[in-house]
Amino acid sequence: TTPEPCELDDEDFRCVCNFSEPQPDWSEAFQCVSAVEVEIHAGGLNLEPFLKRVDADADPRQYADTVKALRVRRLTVGAAQVPAQLLVGALRVLAYSRLKELTLEDLKITGTMPPLPLEATGLALSSLRLRNVSWATGRSWLAELQQWLKPGLKVLSIAQAHSPAFSCEQVRAFPALTSLDLSDNPGLGERGLMAALCPHKFPAIQNLALRNTGMETPTGVCAALAAAGVQPHSLDLSHNSLRATVNPSAPRCMWSSALNSLNLSFAGLEQVPKGLPAKLRVLDLSCNRLNRAPQPDELPEVDNLTLDGNPFLVPGTALPHEGSMNSGVVPAC
């Protein structure tokens, strides 16, 4: 017997659907109507036939009461080929729901997204996460998607993007966006970061994550942030192969005074990089290749320094820096 495609936990909290049959019974998903967090994985199916069964241009207000009764707060949709028109239809209907967090992963969006009709209500998301989503419209995808969202988005995460650079002139500002995560885009690089950080479109960013994004030097990142007018409080550059030295011909970059936390863990560093901010509250240099304790003049003024997992640190060694947070135990790096 084939397993049920959808499973609802005994508390009506989490519902997970895995539709792997070539012609799945989509009605099985109705058991998720009472769940708060819903995950729907479509097994790589092409959802084009859906367009024949639904009227994508129908007034979504007719579904408003039905959709308002959904408890869903967080929705994940994955592994499908989705016509842009169908995605838009779903977003229009979900605008009447309580949905706050939307995750799209392993999707291929085909066709172009129509413009937002004047009477349409945008989706009031606080968090949008995209992983391995390709768009037929290339660089303009963010601007097209953005028009279907209300301007209160707080968290935006874009991983394994096929086009991590955006068409900046078409993108409107994200006035409430405090967290931007571009991690897991290894081809991004510092030049790509400059293209992705559309100037003055991200005025409220506090947390910027750039793990595994092909960054080369903290100074190069500093320059990209300065060019975009982005002043994060927290910057995560972990899991990049960073060079400690700076290109002598590169202009010196002044870090924003707003930056107080910098993560440089798992960055292959053999020495403390040059050109770090002069003052930080938190600096994480764990799991690098530092062969000796950093000298005070190599480090910024820092309250909380983490050096765990570096070769020079043997369990039981005296702490190398006042106020450091080393456990004395080498973590699994």
Epitope: E11, D12, F13, R14, S34, E37, A69, L70, R71
Partner: antibody
Framework: QVQLQESGPGLVKPSETLSLTCTVS?????????WNWIRQPPGKGLEWIGY???????SYNPSLKSRVTISRDTSKNQFSLKLSSVTAADTAVYYC????????WGQGTLVTVSS | DIQLTQSPSSLSASVGDRVTITCRAS??????????LHWYQQKPGKAPKLLIY???NLQSGVPSRFSGSGSRTDFTLTISSLQPEDVATYYC?????????FGQGTKLEIK
């Protein structure tokens, strides 16, 4: 059988940050469910503070949202509450609880806000 | 926010009596076929204990003298034959919509 245990200081000074940790045994906090903090001022009713879900998603009571952070440490199977800028009105028994129908409760810990 | 109003705020009854506590919601707590309204018992110095979930389902280990009914905005907790150990404060709670809210409580005493 899931068990929850709150820990943290019983006395916090006004304007400081209240920090509590809930250690969960018998169940992984990343499996499913919501992991909540609920409080009860002495002699009063119950108030939901917020949750962190199995996925790491959070939801907070709007009345406390500007002061509350709920986070988790999956390696220790723990989740934590931070409530900033506390006043005497935050004096309460704080419970950690599993689910949205609150079937599993810690025994509660009294936190007094006083100078 | 959904407000829950319990009545009465307190009541005194004799052992063996049938006791009814009501809970009224300011808006529906139903989502399709389910009512997300739950009942708890709290004894002094103890954490609350779930009695009834989703309006009418008896939580495992709870005596069968406890029952619940209702839908949308009006709900009832019934104790068919009051026992001395039932002295406690009873709360209703909704989990249909955040913020998840509780009623103000009903204090039950023995005459």
């Amino acid at each position: 059988q899931v068990q929850l245990q709150e820990s943290g200081p019983g006395l916090v000074k006004p304007s400081e940050t209240l920090s509590l940790t809930c250690t969960v045994s018998g169940y992984s906090i990343t499996s499913d469910s919501a992991w909540n903090w609920i409080r009860q001022p002495p002699g009063k009713g119950l108030e939901w503070i917020g949750y962190i879900s199995y996925s790491g998603s959070t939801s907070y009571n709007p009345s406390l949202k500007s002061r509350v952070t709920i986070s988790r440490d999956t390696s220790k199977n723990q989740f934590s509450l931070k409530l900033s800028s506390v006043t005497a009105a935050d004096t309460a028994v704080y419970y950690c609880v599993r689910g949205l129908r609150f079937a599993y409760w810690g025994q509660g810990t009294l936190v007094t806000v006083s100078s | 926010d959904i407000q829950l109003t319990q009545s009465p705020s307190s009541l005194s009854a004799s052992v063996g009596d049938r006791v009814t506590i009501t809970c009224r919601a300011s808006e529906s707590v139903d989502s399709y076929v389910n009512s997300f309204l739950h009942w708890y018992q709290q004894k002094p110095g103890k954490a609350p204990k779930l009695l009834i979930y989703r309006a009418s389902n008896l939580q495992s280990g709870v005596p069968s003298r406890f029952s619940g009914s209702g839908s949308r905005t009006d709900f009832t907790l019934t104790i068919s034959s009051l026992q001395p150990e039932d002295v406690a404060t009873y709360y209703c709670q909704q989990s249909n919509e955040d913020p998840y809210t509780f009623g103000q409580g009903t204090k039950l005493e023995i005459k």
